[in-house]
Interface confidence: low
């Protein structure tokens, strides 16, 4: 079947990185600069993605694969294939239409991206607040007040949570 197809369609013999040139008797021509074809049998090459402005090049375009972009420092990717870059904020902030704003009281954000989320409501699980929340950190819930016998001290607070993406020292 493959042999038959190639007899019928000479373009099927053109490998990735080339295109089937109708202007030259359907011979396989290499993709021009700044274009690529990632599969064989293509009649045109696709224009390479250009990583400009807030985008920067993560992987250069080649004759067989498109360029890949990420975001310049201070920005992070959104969407599949980094179709958008969104401004980073500090921990304890979120991005609004008017720029980075501190999290409101009762909310936190422990990352440079995303939105401020409400502190955990310990009482919903019948627990008490062991460590108060901040703009950057959620509250730490401890045992329920009933679990602490009179005069007993609270349990030792756990070590602070690691920042996302960081391994322990």
């Amino acid at each position: 079947f493959e042999r038959t197809r190639s007899l019928q369609d000479p373009c099927s013999n053109c490998p990735a990185g080339t295109f089937c040139d109708n202007n030259r008797n359907q011979i396989c021509s290499p993709c021009p600069p700044n274009s690529f074809s990632s599969a064989g049998g293509q009649r045109t090459c696709d224009i390479c993605r250009q990583c400009k402005g807030v985008f920067r090049t993560r992987k250069e375009c080649s004759s067989t694969s498109n360029a890949e972009c990420d975001c310049t420092p201070g920005f992070h990717c959104l969407g599949a294939g980094c179709s958008m870059c969104e401004q980073d904020c500090k921990q304890g902030q979120e991005l609004t239409k008017k720029g980075c704003k501190d999290c409101c009281f009762g909310t936190f954000n422990d990352q440079k991206r995303g939105i401020c989320r409400p502190w955990t409501n310990c009482s919903l699980d019948g627990k008490s607040v062991l460590v108060n929340g901040t703009k950057e950190r959620d509250v730490v819930c401890g045992p329920s007040p009933a679990d602490l016998s009179p005069g007993a001290s609270s349990v030792t607070p756990p070590a602070p949570a690691r920042e996302p993406g960081h391994s322990p020292q």
């Epitope: 250009q50 400009k52 402005g53 807030v54 920005f75 959104l78 969407g79 599949a80 179709s83 958008m84 870059c85 969104e86 401004q87 991005l95 239409k97 995303g114 939105i115």
Partner: antibody, heavy 119, light 107 residues
Amino acid sequence: QVQLVQSGAEVKKPGASVKASCKASGFNIQDTYIHWVRQAPGQGLEWMGRIDPANGNSEYAQKFQGRVTMTRDTSTSTVYMELSSLRSEDTAVYYCTTGNLHYALMDYWGQGTSVTVSS
Amino acid sequence: DIQMTQSPSSVSASVGDRVTITCKASQPINTYLSWYQQKPGKAPKLLIYRVNRKVDGVPSRFSGSGSGTDFTLTISSLQPEDFATYYCLQYLDFPYTFGGGTKLEIK
């Protein structure tokens, strides 16, 4: 204030092309994206694509790939959307809309360009 | 493509009623969802972005909520000027996709 003013209504025959314009004022178009959204009579909203006027890069919905071309003229703060091989289903109001660069928001809209495709 | 399924497609309500419109994404869209209001013959108007953030000037009776794939627009007490068609939009990924719309009519 921010304004997007679009070109007037068009009547086209099937197979023809239409080129709608969108002139921006009150902001620098190179600081934003310009999106095009269409709405057929009595139907919902459909995103067609967007252009980054700073560099001319555009992304199109697959449905319109090969038929739509978005361009810009930064000297006149105008963006254009050309749709070719028109068919009756392309009868719609075509809106240009803009949003903050980092949000992909569409918070300012033109008044719309009505395109009627009829033989 | 990410599909946005909006319900109901139409709803009849009276002034003062509480109305809820839902939008379901075919895959998680984080918080990249906005809501638009459109009146006949007019361009859509952005009400809410990033799920729950109101645009300046939008009345407090409008609120948005949800996360992941399920989102809600609530109008706490309908006013005469709220009768319109409402659309959700996901803008996590290309192509951006709108819900089919909810027409809010006077009962």
